[in-house]
């Protein structure tokens, strides 16, 4: 039975040209995390494998940095970065947990962080 929950940074906004941290946290389970995938719609941003460490997709290597923790830092933001991002936690023995973050990249200098929320 999957008892865990994923807490994410929720709906967030950031300025064009700036940086943002995409962060998820798995709680309420003792399952072992074997891998975390970071995906954006039909693109793979990065994988953090418990054995192998971080793999950043070559198409994002120049503007994605691993961390903090199992999170991901997205740099040099453009309006095209607006959209859904998913953290996919592979765990043993529970299985897979998925968290969703919506990022809006703004042209203006006003960019507020959304509230945190939980996905069961």
């Amino acid at each position: 039975m999957m008892t865990g929950t994923i807490e994410t940074t929720g709906n967030i906004s950031a300025e064009k040209g700036g940086s943002i941290i995409l962060q998820c946290h798995l709680s309420s389970t003792t399952a072992q995390v074997t891998q975390v995938n970071w995906e954006q719609q039909d693109q793979l941003l990065a994988i953090c494998n418990a054995d192998l460490g971080w793999h950043i997709s070559p198409s994002f290597k120049d503007r994605v940095a691993p961390g903090p923790g199992l999170g991901l830092t997205l740099q040099s933001l453009t309006v095209n970065d607006t959209g859904e991002y998913f953290c996919i936690y592979h765990t043993y023995p529970d299985g897979t947990y998925t968290g969703r973050i919506f990022l809006e990249v703004l042209e203006s200098s006003v960019a507020e962080h959304g509230a945190r929320f939980q996905i069961p």
Partner: antibody, heavy 121, light 106 residues
């Protein structure tokens, strides 16, 4: 020499689940930093990557197939398996298993010979 | 996804001639591009990786070039066994393949 061999039913009915297994010989599935993948090729058409798995059971999938795909691993048998649910005639293809050097940013370097799966009632 | 477009779809040449195959990516894949050869009833065989490096055992008549979005596979002098279908594949993101170029005997 590393060898991969696909096995499974050659005929699957529409709406059912396609199941295939890849047996790896000449090397251990869990002894290196490789993922293990599935690729398919409809008759007379091009190649499509389905997804890949690490020996720990961690996966990454083609987004267009993700909702129907499950890849699993059995390290004791040196095998990994593919399940594709709710199949239609469009899933008729030769299915290949291959070694996936994801962390080397490298292409699929060892392939099985492929097995044809036909979806038909 | 990154779309790879290969041209031409078919190339009709004679043994001894030079073959030039093109692969264009919908966005930059840097040098993370490979080429495969496939003969009827066989699995693809890796020829070139990282755009220009020959895989183990591949003859020197096969060469790859390009970076970013435009890539070329050249077969300097076609041997009878080279008539086959050739596919490009990118590794910059989720793996995708081109639609293939068939090199046939003229």
């Amino acid at each position: 020499q590393l060898q991969l061999q696909e096995s499974g039913p050659g005929l699957v009915k529409p709406s059912e689940t396609l199941s295939l297994t890849c047996t790896v010989s000449g090397g251990s599935i869990s002894s290196s930093s490789y993922y293990w993948g599935w690729i398919r090729q409809p008759p007379g058409k091009g190649l499509e990557w389905i997804g890949s798995i690490y020996y720990s059971g961690s996966t990454y999938y083609n987004p267009s197939l993700k909702s129907r795909v499950t890849i699993s691993v059995d390290t004791s048998k040196n095998q990994f398996s593919l399940k594709l649910s709710s199949v239609t005639a469009a899933d008729t293809a030769v299915y290949y298993c291959a070694r996936d050097p994801l962390y080397q940013d490298a292409p699929f370097d060892y392939w099985g010979q492929g097995t044809l799966v036909t979806v038909s009632s | 996804e990154i779309v790879l477009t290969q041209s031409p779809a078919t190339l009709s040449l004679s043994p001894g001639e030079r073959a030039t195959l093109s692969c264009r990516a919908s966005q930059s894949v840097s040098s993370y591009l490979a080429w495969y050869q496939q003969k009827p009833g066989q699995a693809p065989r890796l020829l070139i990786y990282d755009a220009s490096n020959r895989a183990t055992g591949i003859p020197a008549r096969f060469s790859g070039s390009g970076s970013g979005t435009d890539f070329t596979l050249t077969i300097s002098s076609l041997e009878p066994e080279d008539f086959a279908v050739y596919y490009c594949q990118q590794r910059a993101n989720f793996p995708t393949f081109g639609g293939g170029t068939k090199v046939e005997i003229k």
